[in-house]
Amino acid sequence: ASGGLPSVSLHPPRLSIQKDILTIMANTTLQITCRGQRDLDWLWPNNQSGSEKRVEVTECSDSFFCKMLTIPKVMGNDTGAYKCFYRDTDMASVIYVYVQDYRSPFIASVSDQHGVVYITENKNKTVVIPCLGSISNLNVSLCARYPEKRFVPDGNRISWDSKKGFTIPSYMISYAGMVFCEAKINDESYQSIMYIVVVVGYKIYDVILSPPHGVELSVGERLVLNCTVRTELNVGLDFNWEYPSLKHQHKKLVNRDLKTQSGSEMKKFLSTLTIDGVTRSDQGWYTCAASSGLMTKRNSTFIRVHEKPFVAFGSGMESSVEATVGDRVRIPVKYLGYPPPEIKWYKNGRPIESNHTIKVGHVLTIMEVSEKDTGNYTVILTNPISKEKQSHVISLVVNVPPQIGEKSLISPVDSYQYGTTQSLTCTVYAVPPPHHIRWYWQLEECAYKPAQAVLMTNPYTCKEWRNVDDFQGGNKIEVNKNQFALIEGKNKTVSTLVIQAANVSALYKCEAVNKVGRGERVISFHVIRGPEITLQPDTQPTEQESVSLWCTADRTTFENLTWYKSGPQALAVHAGEVPTPVCKNLDALWRMNATTFSNGTSDILILELQNVSLQDQGDYVCFAQDRKTKKRHCVVRQLTVLERVAPMITGNLENQTTSIGETIEVSCTTSGNPPPQITWFKDNETLVEDSGIILKDGNRNLTIRRVRKEDEGLYTCQACSVLGCAKVEAFFIVEGAQEKTNLE
């Protein structure tokens, strides 16, 4: 309330016709008065308040806040809700008026020609066809076409309401193109306007461009881009392409629906963009956009257009690569080119083919690099159109962590006689060569625990390696300057430790370090006063030969000589482990049967090995007991058995052409065990030495001086042993005329 007036509660406007529903006949006059407590307004069906001349709203003559609505000659289309409301609030009064027009029982829509009904193919959804009635209790059915189908209200999901229209599950009419309502009055049929059925889907799942990326062309070539769009069912799509050159004459666009499998929940569309002869101005981003009205999805690709075919290496192409033995090496080819070049790899000038260890292509991959992979790798790119070639060399250096040569042998655990001078060597191979080799030592007696040796763990509890400069309590040491030697075709570094007098049993370790790793070798230096071992014969035996091991001890000092052979676990030295002293590891020794005899001052225990095999290799230990102290002394000898190898001739004899009077020198290099006997033949006759024919070096080298015509012929070198023979042949041609000598 305001202005001091008493507060008045606001009531809704009052209509002169106090009914919710009013039914009147067509062509009569509708007049309703509305009274209220403040400014009023009327709303009527179709809301044509501004343009409808037939509807008249006038102020009442007898009171304020009163308006009368008059429609002369009402029609069926005037059926609907008439609402009187206060302008400044939501308060209103409504009456629903049916204008019964039996000639036009359905109210025509505003747009008049036809309506649109949107539906989705969902079993649970209903749709309302808004065929409102001017008569409330009509018998209305729904007609759908094509094919023609009629639906009648069933009191459940299909119904008609004069104020709302015809309600039906949407899937029932999803097949139809159009629907309309039909009413029967006195055997006459009346139809509503037609409603077009639009089945709505709008979801776009994805937009896929093909080729997807990295398309490259040269001027004049044809570009074809396919844009495939997957959507839900009942989707309509607009395609749009965005491209760099808008003024292209040869652009062609084709859009079509793609067939999908029956029962598929998806629809596919394809738009194809074709440019017949691309120019440089066609280079750039191409975007395909698919639009359904309620969704847009896009995808883009960059098209590169080159002036002409070309090939070049990209920046960042390496010139040298370093790797460590065992690494996987990847050398990628970085190139620019169109079309993509053919790629060929060469190593030291030889083509490389892919196999299980090396893969070639855009990337050269060496699965597990080894030293033999060191070298120069050349990659040659060839443009398939212009045949232009580009090459690039990559130098591969394979680094090798230090490897100590002696380590690959069974660790030599020979004993060393007291007081003698001994040299211990470490031959190191490493790439790059080691930047240092250092020697360390510790006492052999350093808390050795046999139980730990059995468990294959380090049996030494003291881990303090001392530098050999600090030889307090040990042997006097001198480390020779490193020497460099070419061994087996490899540059190796040899470090020698000289023990000036072998007084104390000790462990020595050499350690080599380079930039990619370290290697070490532990040498057990076991000093003994007592027994000595000799080998009869004194060379290394070959399989199937016989050998005797003699253990000689001074009989006034020692007694109880026994031979043992160390078992395999005594030899197992794992990387970085300290070797177990054989003499202390009794669990690993096997007693051997041997024969004793004396020669005055010494006892000799002879271990005879007949017909030796590779299994007889290993460490042989002779024990002798001190007569006074009863302390056991031991001495170890490592026996290596050479494998029997059939004769082989390395290298070939070359055919030669010589002039009379010259000298021929040929060499026949053999290998095999036992070493083979070499025999030479000329024209299958044994070659006999004379003044002009000299055989040297166990017949390895043949020299023919002052060659004569009769020296021409087929020469054969034959190497034979008990295991067979090998031979090589060469033909010597002698040119020129034989001159008579003075002597003749």
Epitope: Y118, T120, D238, F239, T287, A289, S291, T296
Partner: antibody, heavy 116, light 107 residues
């Protein structure tokens, strides 16, 4: 900068007409579906109408069907909503929006008041 | 049409709080759900689409989850600029429909 600038709102009597415009810039307008959403004072959002990029597919909410017409002019980068037979319940702020996976760019909105 | 129901209709929270808003669809909509933020007098702003995909430029403190009928928008640590009304919208079936909104205001 990607943006949508709206114009054309105002006061109109019930049964009257109004045309809303939405000018797009900063993106390729002709590639996107566009739509209109409205918001009655103090109420939530209501989708009104949508149009595909080349105007082939057009949709309306039941509440405006037959009275509103959506259209676009790709040459002018513009979207329109022609509103006829306006009712009091059409009073709202009308927003145009660009359609991608969702309605990602919106105009600033324009108020339409339907009152006598 | 698919009805979208948001709860709560309003929530009072402080800066740094974790805020969770839920949205329920009247039938399954898979993951076709979008979240918008609207500040007074401003247009809505897209936050999350397809239930959990963060729109570019939206801070990572906003996250969405859910599938089928029940969905959640979470603000892990509320910032002063996050006080606004949040709407969910389904994009599964025609016509697109919005939830009634959830107003997040200062406690």
């Amino acid at each position: 900068e990607v943006q949508l600038v709206q114009s054309g709102g105002g006061l109109v009597k019930p049964g009257g007409s109004l045309r809303l415009s939405c000018a797009a810039s900063g993106f390729t307008f002709s590639s996107y579906s566009m739509l209109w959403v409205r918001q009655a004072p103090g109420k939530g959002l209501e989708w009104v109408s949508a149009i595909s990029s080349s105007s082939s597919y057009i949709y309306y909410a039941d509440s405006v069907k037959g009275r509103f017409t959506i259209s676009r002019d790709n040459a002018k980068n513009s979207l329109y909503l022609q509103m006829n037979s306006l009712r009091a319940e059409d009073t709202a702020v009308y927003y145009c929006a660009r359609v991608t996976d969702a309605f990602d760019i919106w105009g600033q909105g324009t108020l339409v008041t339907v009152s006598s | 049409d698919i009805q979208m129901t948001q709860s709560p209709s309003s929530v009072s929270a402080s800066v740094g709080d974790r805020v969770t808003i839920t949205c329920r669809a009247s039938r399954g909509i898979d993951n076709w759900l979008t979240w918008y933020q609207q500040k007074p007098g401003k247009a809505p702003k897209l936050l999350i689409y397809e239930a959990s995909s963060l729109q570019s430029g939206v801070p990572s403190r906003f996250s969405g989850s859910g599938s089928g009928t029940d969905f959640t928008l979470t603000i892990s640590s509320l910032q002063p600029e996050d006080f606004a009304t949040y709407y969910c919208q389904q994009a599964k079936a025609f016509p697109p429909t919005f939830g009634g909104g959830t107003k997040v205001d200062i406690k």
